[in-house]
């Protein structure tokens, strides 16, 4: 059965067109419900949109929004279960593995920094001609022989990073995890062992590196190979294209601006609704996003919208003291948040995101890359080709790492430090969803149409 996706008119019509007229307005379906909310909230048939319900599992919006038919069923972000953020970098100060983060924080930081992998035995039969086309490690499509073994870009990159950074992994299970295309990121230990078992050679990585090593210390370290497929310049352009114009930042204190309500929660919801308009336009400007199947684009935006918006307003708030700056130009002070009953989550945003971004002076390119990593979430449920999304995420990792080395060569740990914001972002994003569903359930907070659409989609647990 076809599922209809309700998206901005020009998301469907302009998705492959030029980006000169970014006027998108519309909504996407919501990510999956946090398990702690229990069943029912936001599930179909129980809470209806105030707007007309169209013949679709997703409560629709009517004109001027288009209905995009899709062969996929309802999609949602998978709520993670067993996270791992165990990795070490090549720099001496980060040589020991990080502690695993709690289950709500599994963001799968890259490079292999996310773990995974159980690999099925090859199907029976003569593999001689077949293996040239599939990855010996995970069974994905092979891009050729890498380090002595036919392998995909993902496993090639994972092996290269492991060797170059001299990473060590641990297996949380019995060292016999299945490594396949879908699960290759779950256990880095077993993935690496499989790389070795299949014949990948560490020396081949080192020799490759040595060939490019004789470079004068004042020559620009080339970022082109990492950057050409996922140019950070374009990621920055995407950020700049959708950032609110500074003239919209009125110094409006809560309650003093007659056009804005006193309630900070309402102000935040209105700002989120406004930013959802631009989220599609932003995503379209991220390299390769528009090349994904339309259904997968919908799934990714649906899965990541909350974290994407939180990352943006957190970074925008770097210059604000004890508060956040909304896209509408309004400041929300922590005192207002506390008085509105959302002080705890607000303080988490300030301490785990805003102040950390401020302390390291995270720049807009880095922000854009982190958001692109969130966007390209291969664990989003229902993707037609998770491996393709994972490959894009890995490209962002590589470009971000190259950018950090290029712009901040004094700080070998900066790339890792950036990635370590992702678990907090995931955790805070899930908690914010809980709050949103609660406000929606109670019904005393005005939730505008686009934000409501996010909360109206069917949810599936993983």
């Amino acid at each position: 059965m076809d599922t209809k996706h309700f998206l901005p008119l020009d998301f469907s019509t302009q998705v492959n067109s030029s980006l000169t007229s970014p006027t998108g307005r519309g909504s996407m379906a919501a990510p999956s419900l946090h398990p702690s909310l229990g069943p029912g909230i936001g599930s179909p048939g129980q809470l209806h949109s105030p707007i007309s319900t169209l013949s679709s599992p997703i409560n629709g919006m009517g004109p001027p929004f288009s209905v995009i038919s899709s062969p996929m069923g309802p999609h949602s972000m998978s709520v993670p279960t067993t996270p791992t953020l165990g990795f070490s970098t090549g720099s001496p100060q980060l040589s020991s593995p990080m502690n695993p983060v709690s289950s709500s924080e599994d963001i799968k930081p890259p490079l292999g920094l996310n773990g995974v992998l159980k690999v099925p035995a090859h199907p029976s039969g003569n593999m001689a001609s077949f293996t040239k086309h599939i990855c010996a490690i995970c069974g994905d499509r092979s891009s050729g022989k890498h380090y002595g073994v036919y392998s995909c870009e993902g496993c090639k990159g994972f092996f290269k990073r492991t060797v170059r950074k001299d990473l060590t992994y641990t297996c949380r299970d019995n060292k016999d995890c299945l490594i396949d295309k879908r699960q290759r990121n779950r256990c880095q230990y077993c993935r690496y062992q499989k790389c070795l078992a299949m014949g990948m050679k560490r020396e081949a990585v080192q020799e490759e590196r040595q060939r490019g090593k004789d470079r004068n210390e004042n020559e620009v370290e080339s970022t082109s190979s990492a950057n050409e497929d996922m140019p950070v310049e374009r990621i920055l352009e995407a950020e700049l294209a959708v950032e609110p114009k500074t003239e919209t930042y009125v110094e409006a204190n809560m309650g003093l601006n007659p056009s804005s309500p006193n309630d900070p929660v309402t102000n935040i919801c209105q700002a989120a609704d406004k930013q959802l308009f631009t989220l599609v336009e932003w995503a379209k400007r991220i390299p390769h996003f528009s090349e994904l199947p339309l259904d997968d684009q919908v799934i990714l935006l649906r899965a990541g919208w909350n974290e994407l918006l939180i990352a943006s307003f957190s970074h925008r708030s770097i210059a604000v003291k004890d508060g956040i700056l909304l896209a509408t130009g309004l400041h929300v002070h922590r005192n207002s948040a506390h008085s509105a009953g959302v002080g705890a989550i607000f303080d988490r945003v300030l301490t785990e995101l805003v102040s950390k971004m401020r302390d390291m002076q995270m720049d807009k390119t880095e922000l854009g890359c982190l958001r692109a990593i969130v966007l390209f979430n291969p664990d989003s449920k229902g993707l037609s080709n998770p491996a393709e999304v994972e490959a894009l995420r890995e490209k962002v990792y590589a470009s971000l790492e190259a950018y950090c080395k290029h712009k901040y060569p004094e700080q070998p740990g900066r790339f890792a430090k950036l990635l370590l914001r992702l678990p907090a972002l995931r955790s805070i994003g899930l908690k914010c969803l809980e709050h949103l569903f609660f406000f929606k359930l109670i019904g005393d907070t005005p939730i505008d149409t686009f934000l409501m659409e996010m909360l109206e989609a069917p949810h599936q647990m993983t």
Epitope: N218, E219, D359, K407, E410, Q411
Partner: antibody, heavy 119, light 110 residues
């Protein structure tokens, strides 16, 4: 070959604004990875970093002096300008501009210009 | 006071080996690379060591750098009279989002 040269007043009065210009050659501030910084050294004392501007116009300032400093670049003229407001006698120092190395911090320095703050 | 701590002075005779220490914290040396500069009297600082232990071209191999934890050191072997200068260590300071320098060590060749 990379060279940098600082220019500006040698004497400024307290409360006045100091404007220093760094004119450089051998590199372009439009090249990815390039940056120019300012460092000062009071007589007989240690080096102190003031500001840094990157090729992408990103700017960094010493937190203790941030409110008084502004760094700008003119790529076409191969120049970087530092302004420092509300000068005080304790700001008397040799001011250096330096090329930010691709391997980090500063590899090529100007000869420095001594700025004395006195009424 | 400087963020990075160096002994104010050091000395040695020609041919000797001398070591200059630089002590910092987890937010500078502990998490970032260390750089060393040589400043001859009346001149601008010269890039001596980068990324803890790397020498730019033109710097003699008598100069070597090392780092351990939150401390670093510069060793000069086969000391010469022309090595008499002020030596500064430097590192990126995370809390400042900028570089910090040591107080400098005046090396005297006896």
């Amino acid at each position: 070959q990379i060279t940098l040269k600082e220019s500006g007043p040698t004497l400024v009065k307290p409360t006045q604004t100091l404007t220093l210009t760094c004119t450089f050659s051998g590199f372009s501030l439009s090249t990815s990875g390039v940056g120019v910084g300012w460092i000062r050294q009071p007589p007989g004392k240690a080096l102190e970093w003031l500001a840094l501007i990157y090729w992408d116009d990103d700017k960094r300032y010493s937190p203790s002096l941030k409110s008084r400093l502004t760094i700008t670049k003119d790529t076409s003229k191969n120049q970087v300008v530092l302004t420092m407001t509300n000068m005080d006698p304790v700001d008397t120092a040799t001011y250096y501009c330096a090329h930010r190395a691709i391997v980090g911090l500063f590899d090529y320095w100007g000869q420095g210009t001594l700025v004395t703050v006195s009424s | 006071p400087s963020v990075l701590t160096q002994p104010p002075s050091a000395s040695g005779t020609p041919g000797q080996r001398v070591t200059i220490s630089c002590s910092g914290s987890s937010s500078n040396i502990g998490s970032n690379y260390v750089y060393w500069y040589q400043q001859l009297p009346g001149t601008a600082p010269k890039f001596l060591i980068y990324r803890n232990n790397q020498r730019p071209s033109g710097v003699p191999d008598r100069f070597s750098g090392s780092k351990s934890g939150t401390s670093a050191s510069l060793a000069i072997s086969g000391l010469r009279s022309e090595d008499e200068a002020d030596y500064y260590c430097a590192a990126w300071e995370d809390s400042l989002s900028g570089p910090v320098f040591g107080g400098g060590t005046k090396l005297t060749v006896l």
